[in-house]
């Protein structure tokens, strides 16, 4: 029957023996033998390995491509990848922020419910009755119609989701 060998969490089974994994920030250059320990080497500049590993190559640091609207949020190290984010006025289109899209403005008749962030687009909602938005905007919410009554005026033109009420002097005709 085959022997069952269990290695620790920072080791790997290789040809019947437990070899040490290479620590984050390094890569494998030689497997261990009965006489020698695992040989590891630091990742070169521009590379990283984030976990205990037995990989022959470190991973290349990500490049935040300016032509895709990306910029560096956090520089990579020997143990971590570069983190990209989007330029002002744009947001990431995926969890890994591989590309950016312009924030979407809320069109007239819609107000901003949630402003865009670096990872999410603007959330718009239709202006309910009694509220309006008359411009495309990344931050304006729906505003309430003017109360003509409060100003001792009368409604000359009803408001819509895109326009405010127009008030005027009360007619003297009885």
């Amino acid at each position: 029957l085959g022997q069952c060998v269990t290695c620790s969490d920072k080791q790997y089974l290789h040809d019947g023996q437990c070899c040490d994994l290479c620590q984050p920030g390094s890569r494998l250059t030689s497997h261990c033998t009965a006489l020698e320990k695992t040989q590891c080497h630091p990742c070169d500049s521009g590379e990283f390995s984030a976990q205990w590993n037995r990989e022959i190559r470190c991973h290349q640091h990500r490049h935040c491509e300016p032509n895709q609207g990306l910029r560096v949020k956090k520089e990579g190290t020997a143990e971590s990848d570069t983190v990209c984010t989007c330029k002002e006025g744009q947001h990431c289109t995926s969890k890994d922020c591989e590309a950016c899209a312009q924030h979407t403005p809320c069109i007239p008749g819609f107000g901003v419910m949630e402003m865009a962030t670096e990872t999410t687009d603007t959330v718009c909602h239709p202006c309910p009755v009694g509220f309006f938005s008359n411009q495309s905007s990344l931050f304006e919410k729906c505003y309430p119609w003017t109360s003509c009554e409060d100003k001792n005026l009368e409604v000359l033109q009803k408001g819509t989701s895109q326009t405010n009420v127009i008030c005027g002097l009360k007619s003297r005709m009885r």
Partner: antibody
Framework: EVQLVESGGGLVQPGRSLKLSCAAS????????MAWVRQAPTKGLEWVAS????????YYRDSVKGRFTVSRDNAKSTLYLQMDSLRSEDTATYYC??????????WGQGVMVTVSS | DTVLTQSPALAVSPGERVTISCRAS??????MHWYQQKPGQQPKLLIY???HLESGVPARFSGSGSGTDFTLTIDPVEADDTATYYC?????????FGGGTKLELK
């Protein structure tokens, strides 16, 4: 005894495809990174591609990226090199080699690939 | 790419000591390896990580160096050592081989 035996070479026209195989025996194939290294006639050695033990990571030299695909079948202990859009400069003896970390501790006898019209 | 420069050929007499050099265009730390290739055969690993002797390789072979300058020494040379010797680095991407040094016996 470690053995690596390549097959699938031959004469092929530019632009055509060829698939090389390497049958491995005498060691636990799924434990090792594997590679293809080539040698043009009367020339030196040139690393072509490597693949991780699980097949999850692959590495290529720039001149073959997008044209060559390295793969493996651990159940069959076989390494493959799919070569598409072949060029005359791909003419060489192709060796299958076993990685021990970052060097090559065992090599096959090699298989000749000639790209010519 | 890292360029590895080797002298193309050497001729020595059996019993002598020979040193084969390999110079890298940039530092490769100790990630340098040496192979022997006899005519019509596949390469064979001799030395790995600059100075480690591969199992089964005679102790006549030794390696030294770090950074950019590396040496393979054969002492004493035997008739069977007629071959081309290649250095290989695994520090930079892509891994590269030297052009080879052809060793001939007088």
């Amino acid at each position: 005894e470690v053995q690596l035996v390549e097959s699938g070479g031959g004469l092929v026209q530019p632009g055509r495809s060829l698939k090389l195989s390497c049958a491995a025996s005498g060691f636990t194939f799924s434990n090792y990174d594997m590679a293809w290294v080539r040698q043009a006639p009367t020339k030196g050695l040139e690393w072509v591609a490597s693949i991780s033990p699980s097949g999850g990571r692959t590495y290529y030299r720039d001149s073959v990226k997008g044209r060559f695909t390295v793969s493996r079948d651990n159940a069959k202990s076989t390494l493959y090199l799919q070569m598409d859009s072949l060029r005359s400069e791909d003419t060489a003896t192709y060796y299958c080699a076993r990685h021990d970390g970052s060097y090559f501790d065992y090599w096959g006898q090699g298989v000749m690939v000639t790209v010519s019209s | 790419d890292t360029v590895l420069t080797q002298s193309p050929a050497l001729a020595v007499s059996p019993g002598e000591r020979v040193t084969i050099s390999c110079r890298a265009s940039e530092s490769v730390s100790t990630l340098m390896h040496w192979y022997q290739q006899k005519p019509g055969q596949q390469p064979k690993l001799l030395i790995y990580l600059a100075s480690h002797l591969e199992s089964g390789v005679p102790a006549r072979f030794s390696g030294s160096g770090s950074g950019t300058d590396f040496t393979l020494t054969i002492d004493p040379v035997e008739a069977d050592d007629t071959a081309t010797y290649y250095c290989q680095e695994s520090w930079n991407d892509p891994w590269t081989f030297g052009g080879g040094t052809k060793l001939e016996l007088k």
